[in-house]
């Protein structure tokens, strides 16, 4: 999906008011310095691409993020504020239902959410001009 035509300000507002709070809850008890960011993004569409990938694509050691509250709210925000996003996700959702596993917060998941935190932080910044 191409995130270029999303309403970034509306997604930013959704992140600040709700998604961030769920990330805070998920990461509670974890030091902000515990994990270093290894995933970055260069502009808002790129940030959303990386956020979608980390939130909804299962990875080794962390298969369950898509069912977390922050993930559901992320999905809702993208569906509302990115034209045509919902249609692209129908097949992905059906695939997710087939491999549903019980929720387990592993260290790998905490690391992945820490990466998400960094991507959202970068998305949240207004455009910075290069020197």
């Amino acid at each position: 999906y191409d995130f270029t035509n999303c309403d970034f300000e509306k997604i930013k507002a959704a992140y600040l008011s709700t998604i961030s709070k769920d990330l805070i809850t998920y990461m509670s008890g974890t030091k902000s310095t515990e994990f270093n960011n290894t995933v970055s993004c260069s502009n808002r569409p790129h940030c959303l691409t990386e956020i979608q990938s980390l939130t909804f694509n299962p990875t080794a050691g962390c298969a369950s993020l898509a069912k977390e509250m922050f993930a559901m709210k992320t999905k809702a925000a993208l569906a509302i504020w990115c034209p045509g996003y919902s249609e692209t996700q129908i097949n992905a959702t059906q695939a997710m239902k087939k491999r549903r596993k019980r929720k387990v917060t592993t260290n790998k998941c905490l690391e992945q959410v820490s990466q998400l935190q960094g991507l959202w932080r970068r998305f949240n910044r207004p455009l910075l001009k290069q020197q």
Epitope: T33, N37, S42, R121, L127, K129
Partner: antibody
Framework: QVQLQQSGAELVRPGASVKLSCKAS????????MHWVKQTPVHGLEWIGT????????AYTQKFKGKATLTADISSNTAYVELRSLTSEDSAVYYC????????????WGQGTTLSVSS | DIVMTQSQKFMSTSVGDRVSITCKAS??????VAWYQQKPGQSPKTLIF???NRHTGVPDRFTGSGSGTDFTLTISNVQSEDLADYFC?????????FGGGTKLEIK
């Protein structure tokens, strides 16, 4: 733990330039934007601008464009603000402050650097 | 630029009381507001971020509320060590802007 260590007080002549530093420790320097804030009794707290250490990208308040230049050295985890063509109006306490973990706020503050511009 | 107005420059309260400090934005800043406490001779300290989240180590007598244009910092059971200046800051759009501050005095 996160620490922002700022350079010591400066006394400089009008018309000169000065470069204030802020050494970061306890976190990954390139992961967080750094902000600079000016404080005077008259104007209170004023946001000067921000820099993304990873890209060197910056943003400034209009008032400080041409007055302040923000840079960052990732080899030493240090952010800088250079102030030029100094006048008595630039006398203030200058703070560096780090972008918050979740964005949309700043969390940790340096101890401040007092700049006095006087002939 | 977004203007952040703290209409009360000074507030006087007694130990044990509850006090509310307000901040009004000139346009919608959603929940991108933080509150800071500054004691004499010290750098500011973060109290509340994203309008209602307490920063690490901040006592739970400090609470933040609001969204859009109206924000409130409430201190319940005021202690003598709460004597300080309190500032709001909007971080929705560059340039970020501070409120003028509210000085809390203890009777």
């Amino acid at each position: 733990q996160v620490q922002l260590q700022q350079s010591g007080a400066e006394l400089v002549r009008p018309g000169a330039s000065v470069k204030l530093s802020c050494k970061a420790s306890g976190y990954m320097f390139t992961d967080y934007a750094m902000h600079w804030v000016k404080q005077t009794p008259v104007h209170g707290l004023e946001w000067i601008g921000t820099i993304d250490p990873e890209t060197g990208g910056t943003a400034y308040t209009q008032k400080f464009k041409g007055k302040a230049t923000l840079t960052a050295d990732i080899s030493s985890n240090t952010a800088y603000v250079e102030l030029r063509s100094l006048t008595s109006e630039d006398s203030a306490v200058y703070y560096c402050t780090r972008e918050g973990s979740y964005g949309g706020y700043v969390d940790y503050w340096g101890q401040g650097t007092t700049l006095s511009v006087s002939s | 630029d977004i203007v952040m107005t703290q209409s009360q420059k000074f507030m006087s309260t007694s130990v044990g009381d509850r006090v509310s400090i307000t901040c009004k934005a000139s346009q919608n800043v959603h929940t991108a507001v933080a509150w800071y406490q500054q004691k004499p001779g010290q750098s500011p300290k973060t109290l509340i971020f994203l309008a209602s989240n307490r920063h690490t180590g901040v006592p739970d007598r400090f609470t933040g509320s609001g969204s859009g244009t109206d924000f409130t910092l409430t201190i319940s059971n005021v202690q003598s060590e709460d004597l300080a200046d309190y500032f709001c800051l909007q971080l929705w759009n560059y340039p970020y802007t501070f409120g003028g501050g509210t000085k809390l005095e203890i009777k």
